[in-house]
Interface confidence: low
């Protein structure tokens, strides 16, 4: 008798994604000696414990931890670049200037980065139709409830300085349901945390506006300041010339405004 | 699998010239400063040359400055080592890795350094 199955509103579980798992394991661990140590199949094991015979509406941090230990890695926390909606930008300057961190660029991050992933209740199937989406369906899903976990964590992990790279082409520079906004900003540490300095970048070539005066960014700046942590906003109004400066800071064109 | 394989070594006179190469198997090199280093017999693996991610910055080791050139192809997959003016001090077995970082401000980065191959034996004698 075929077996019913719960058809949910999202994307089902990436094709492959055990072995896309475990090949980023061993490859992360192969470039980064720190994490050398790092069992892959151990990881792979707790990943999937954390999802398997579970029903997808109903995962906790609790489910992810056995992960979360495997996972453990010390990044230097006043290196951190946060980012909303502007994830490929972030990636790329932190592929440049390779002593920055963002979320992805560590072991946890980088396995799970674009994929999707759900189990069902009681079986050990991954279910590869479809998984919850997280406003149609629930919140408490596998893929949510693990970047809420990593997101937390590596917030409260950060120190000094922390930058967040967010996109001045939406509408909601700043979004207080977004990861960064909703996760992030509420557990970076007062006590450890001195600045958080967002970089607004600018979509089109000739937009000269200040975005730092918008009106999400002018809530961000009193979220922070609430929380006993500075503020500060610089324009990034040319990502391209940014970026090639960063690769290449004795260039001329470089010590002007970008 | 991910490794680096180095080849282009041999035997060559002093004052000669050798093109090491050093080539990913597994992974891009894109996004990685990559150093090339050398093991002189009886002595600790040294840093001699890096070039960073954007192949427009580079750092040497004063031992090699002004004879050894390092240089990257564009297509992400090799790193090579020109070698001229070779002198018997430059006999050992050289090596190539990625850092973690991009940029080269230092050669004292032995750390940063992962995923050692077999390297390739140089050997400079008349």
């Known amino acids: 008798v075929p077996r019913w199955r719960q058809q949910w509103s999202g994307p089902g579980t990436t094709k492959r994604f055990p072995e896309t798992v475990l090949a980023r394991c061993v490859k992360y661990t192969e470039i980064h000696p720190e994490m050398r140590h790092v069992d892959c199949q151990s990881v792979w094991d707790a990943f999937k414990g954390a999802f398997i015979s579970k029903h997808p509406c109903n995962i906790t941090e609790e489910d992810y931890q056995p992960l979360m230990k495997l996972g453990t890695q010390t990044v230097p926390c006043n290196k951190i670049l946060l980012w909303s909606r502007i994830k490929d930008l972030a990636h790329q300057f932190t592929q440049v200037q390779r002593d920055m961190f963002t979320l992805e660029d560590t072991l946890l991050g980088y396995l799970a980065d674009d994929l999707t992933w759900c189990g069902e209740f009681n079986t050990s199937k991954i279910n590869y139709q479809s998984c919850p989406d997280w406003r149609k369906d629930c919140s408490n899903n596998p893929v949510s409830v693990f970047w809420k976990t990593v997101s937390r964590r590596f917030a409260e992990a950060a120190c000094d300085v922390v930058h967040v790279m967010l996109n001045g082409s939406r509408s909601k520079i700043f979004d207080k349901n977004s990861t960064f906004g909703s996760v992030e900003v509420h557990n970076l540490q007062p006590e450890k945390v001195q600045t958080l300095e967002a970089w607004v970048i600018h979509g089109g070539r000739e937009d000269s506006r200040d975005l730092c005066q918008d009106p999400t960014i002018k809530e961000l700046e009193s979220i922070i300041s609430k929380r006993n942590i500075q503020f500060s906003c610089k324009n990034i109004y040319r990502p391209d010339k940014f970026l090639q400066c960063v690769k290449n800071p004795e260039d001329s064109s470089c010590t002007s405004e970008i | 699998q991910v490794q680096l394989v180095e080849s282009g070594g041999g035997l060559v006179q002093p004052g000669g010239s050798l093109t090491l190469s050093c080539r990913a198997s597994g992974f891009t090199l894109d996004y990685y400063a990559i150093g090339w280093f050398r093991q002189a017999p009886g002595k600790e693996r040294e840093a001699i040359a890096c070039?960073?991610?954007?192949?427009?910055?580079?750092n040497y080791g004063d031992s090699v400055s002004g004879r050894f050139t390092i240089s990257r192809d564009n297509a992400g997959t090799t790193v090579y080592l020109q070698m001229n003016s070779l002198e018997a001090e430059d006999t050992g077995i050289y090596y190539c890795?990625?850092?973690?970082?991009?940029?080269?401000?230092?050669?004292?980065?032995?750390?940063?350094?992962?995923?050692w191959g077999q390297g390739t034996q140089v050997t400079v004698s008349s």
């Open positions: 070039i960073d991610i954007t192949g427009f910055h580079t």
């Open positions: 890795a990625p850092a973690r970082y991009a940029a080269c401000s230092a050669l004292d980065v032995k750390l940063s350094f992962t995923s």
